[in-house]
Interface confidence: low
């Protein structure tokens, strides 16, 4: 019973996801003290970000609605030092952060991280201002890493009658126009909880009107075709779903995609068992369905994006969200999102406070980074269907796409299967006719070292994954399997399998 037969549906794609399907975020809280945005000047961090291109980089989060642009604000000493060090360089071939500045910021970061997490848990948010330098830092990081920046504007700037006050946004738009910064926009973050965060209640219809106002501003700016995404609501519980519905009725016409957020767990209470529980993974399905119900009943056919998502909210689950164990949730969410028609999934966060980052405070990639990198290289935009034959197989989760056609190793018509084994025994997957005798390349991820699933290091087909140097990612080496053999998937592991020469016409 450890041999499992698979079923494929390959006649036509179920969905077509964006080439930027797997995207990332930088939490707006990184700008609370704008000096820490200098971290984005790290060549190593940029190398890692480039590995995930094409992707969106969303700058947003709770702090979005507590940040105010001040074009007259002076840069800090650290920011001036950074820009001074870059003066004679090609902006994208940046030298490193000045060593004294980096050392100072690194030593202060643990304290700053605690400040940010405490602010989040206590739900006491203070307004902060950011300067032109902060905008430059963000845009340069995105642009030099091949990422498309999406900037979240403060939606809590209100007139006396609760209309959105767009004057601060206008200042930022004017600055970005002057610099020829080409980016997309959002307005507000999780407006469903404004009452809790700021004692202000904004209903969906009002928010829709606010988006219409922002849309008009964008049409008047240099970038008439700038995209606008929203409303970045939280999970679709009853009141949030109602808010989304009334927002879409009022303002849905002016947004390019509908954005919402999802977390499985509370980071403070999550356990290792939760991270490996198929019941927990399955709750995502009903959340997606509810969002689609609302969208289809108000703006049929409008694209749906996960605008912010991770394993656990509140910065993630300590000792879990940054380990190999987090990959089960991340890969399953990517698979389900693609299968269910979500066009883009934005991972909270690429780099920043908490435990759910892809890259840690030393700019070292964590297991979910390597998983994301493999996904980018192997998984294409055309979504097919794989399923496990037989009942009660939720511990074995399989997803199927056409292979990424940008990968020079593979060709059109090839298939990428990715699979998650939550059983405590190895499972052997058998491909269906006519694929069972094809050449298959295996990319198996396993944790490295004594910490097992809680390891922060990972092996690909038995080889430890680490950067060659700050400018170079390692080759991702396949393991060719003997044609006709079953695909072994060890207990509590995940893997990609590329089926070569599959000749699937839909691909």
């Amino acid at each position: 019973q450890d041999v499992v037969d698979l079923d494929f549906f390959t006649q036509q794609p179920l969905h077509l996801v964006s080439p930027s399907f797997l995207s990332v975020t930088i939490d707006a809280n990184l700008a609370t003290d704008p000096r820490f945005l200098i971290f984005l000047g790290s060549p190593k961090l940029r190398t890692l970000a480039r590995g995930l291109s094409p992707a969106y980089l969303r700058f947003g989060g709770t702090k979005t609605d507590f940040l105010i642009f001040d074009p007259k604000k002076e840069s800090t000493f650290e920011e001036r030092s950074y820009w001074q060090s870059q003066v004679n360089q090609d902006i994208c071939k940046s030298g490193s952060i000045p060593p004294d500045v980096e050392e100072k910021l690194r030593s202060e970061w643990p304290y700053q991280e605690q400040v940010l997490l405490r602010e989040h848990y206590q739900k006491k948010f203070k307004n902060s201002t950011y300067s032109r330098s902060s905008v430059d830092m963000l845009y340069t990081f995105a642009n030099c890493s091949g990422l498309d920046l999406i900037f979240g504007l403060n939606a809590l700037l209100r007139t006396a009658d609760l209309q959105w006050n767009s004057s601060n946004a206008q200042l930022l738009l004017d600055y970005c126009s002057s610099k020829r910064y080409n980016m997309s926009w959002e307005l507000g973050n999780e407006p469903n909880s404004f009452l809790k965060k700021a004692d202000i209640f904004i209903n969906g219809s009002q928010l829709g009107e606010d988006f219409i106002q922002l849309h008009k501003l964008l049409r008047k700016s240099t970038f008439k075709n700038a995209k606008l995404y929203g409303p970045d609501v939280g999970q679709p519980r009853r009141k949030t779903a109602e808010m989304l519905k009334s927002f879409l009725k009022a303002g849905g016409e002016v947004i390019d995609s509908v954005t919402w957020h999802h977390y499985y767990l509370n980071g403070r209470t999550a356990t290792e068992e939760d991270f490996l529980n198929p019941d927990v993974l399955d709750i995502f399905i009903s959340s997606v369905q509810k969002v689609f119900q609302v969208v289809e009943s108000t703006r049929p056919g409008k694209k749906v994006w996960l605008g912010e998502t991770s394993s656990a909210y509140g910065g993630g689950a300590p000792l879990l969200s940054d380990t190999f164990a987090a990959g089960f949730m991340w890969l399953d969410k990517l698979g389900l999102s693609a299968r269910m028609g979500i066009e883009v999934v934005m991972r909270q966060v690429f780099f920043g406070a908490g435990n759910y980052h892809l890259v840690d405070e030393n700019f070292d990639p964590l297991p979910d980074y390597w998983l994301s990198l493999l996904f980018k290289k192997l998984v294409g935009t055309k979504v097919l269907m794989a399923s496990v034959k037989g009942p009660k197989r939720r511990n074995l989760r399989v997803y199927l796409h056409c292979t990424n056609t940008d990968n020079p190793m593979y060709k059109e018509g090839d298939l990428t299967l990715y699979a998650i084994n939550l059983y405590n025994v190895t499972k052997y997957l058998r491909l269906p006719y006519p694929f069972f005798d094809k050449q298959v390349d295996k990319y198996l991820l396993r944790p490295l070292g004594p910490h097992g699933l809680l390891s922060k290091a990972v092996q690909l087909n038995g080889q430890t994954l680490k950067m060659v140097d700050d400018q170079t990612l390692p080759p991702l080496m396949e393991k060719p399997l003997r044609p006709g053999s079953s695909l072994g998937l060890p207990a509590f592991s995940y893997s990609f399998f590329v089926i070569r020469n599959a000749k699937v016409a839909a691909c």
Epitope: L14, S286, Q289, K290, F292, G301, G341, R394
Partner: antibody, heavy 123, light 112 residues
Framework: QVQLVESGGGVVQPGRSLRLSCAAS????????MHWVRQAPGKGLEWVAV????????YYADSVKGRFTISRDNSKNTLNLQMNSLRAEDTAVYYC????????????????WGQGTTVTVSS | YIVMTQSPLSLPVTPGEPASISCRSS???????????LDWYLQKPGQSPQLLIY???NRASGVPDRFSGSGSGTDFTLKINRVEAEDVGVYYC?????????FGQGTRLEIK
């Protein structure tokens, strides 16, 4: 294996009530929408009602609206159809069917059917 | 609601010969996602209906490849390229685009 088994049919007088049940097994019941479809003797198929995976939405054919109620108990993997104010024209074999739209909530179709239970409304 | 009309209502066929059933809807079944929300079902004598084709042209699991569905918008066709004795029964088309869900009247396929 995936299975749906209807029960609760029988002979009942016009104006009376009857409750049909459908027991599901072999799949994650709580992830799927479920339908009732009926077939009068010698006639074609007629859709009766659908309920979404979580019970949040229910839709009915005009011919049964206000008289029939579809419900589900996800903890017991059971689908129900409460039929009140029965009429002679409700005489039919009643089938429950699974909606494959677990990943496309708006897809109404039936990929698995039960064997049916017969309801006869007669005085 | 959407009215589904099938033709012919009766279809006698010689084994090994092809068969074709037409289904027309009173409004388009093409969803904004590019799929036609039309299914074909077969009800064999004394049995429950079974799904043959979903979303206009996709064969359901376990359905022989002699069955195929085609069409878009309002006009759809179910083809059997070589009828076998086990294919007898009543074939129904059904629109799955919106509630109330509606079926065609059925086409009875019998062996000559």
């Amino acid at each position: 294996q995936v299975q749906l088994v209807e029960s609760g049919g029988g002979v009942v007088q016009p104006g009376r009530s009857l409750r049909l049940s459908c027991a599901a097994s072999g799949f994650t019941f709580s992830s799927y929408g479920m339908h009732w479809v009926r077939q009068a003797p010698g006639k074609g198929l007629e859709w009766v009602a659908v309920i979404w995976y979580d019970g949040s939405n229910k839709y009915y054919a005009d011919s049964v609206k206000g008289r029939f109620t579809i419900s589900r108990d996800n903890s017991k993997n059971t689908l129900n159809l409460q039929m009140n104010s029965l009429r002679a024209e409700d005489t039919a074999v009643y089938y429950c069917g699974r909606d494959p739209g677990t990943y496309h909530y708006y897809y109404h179709g039936m990929d698995v059917w039960g064997q049916g239970t017969t309801v006869t409304v007669s005085s | 609601y959407i009215v589904m009309t099938q033709s012919p209502l009766s279809l006698p066929v010689t084994p090994g010969e092809p068969a074709s059933i037409s289904c027309r809807s009173s409004q388009s079944l093409l969803h904004s996602n590019g799929y036609n929300f039309l299914d074909w079902y077969l009800q064999k004598p004394g049995q429950s209906p079974q799904l043959l084709i979903y979303l206009g042209s996709n064969r359901a699991s376990g359905v022989p490849d002699r069955f195929s569905g085609s069409g878009s918008g309002t006009d759809f066709t179910l083809k059997i390229n070589r009828v076998e004795a086990e294919d007898v029964g009543v074939y129904y088309c059904m629109q799955a685009l919106q509630t109330p869900i509606t079926f065609g009247q059925g086409t009875r396929l019998e062996i000559k």
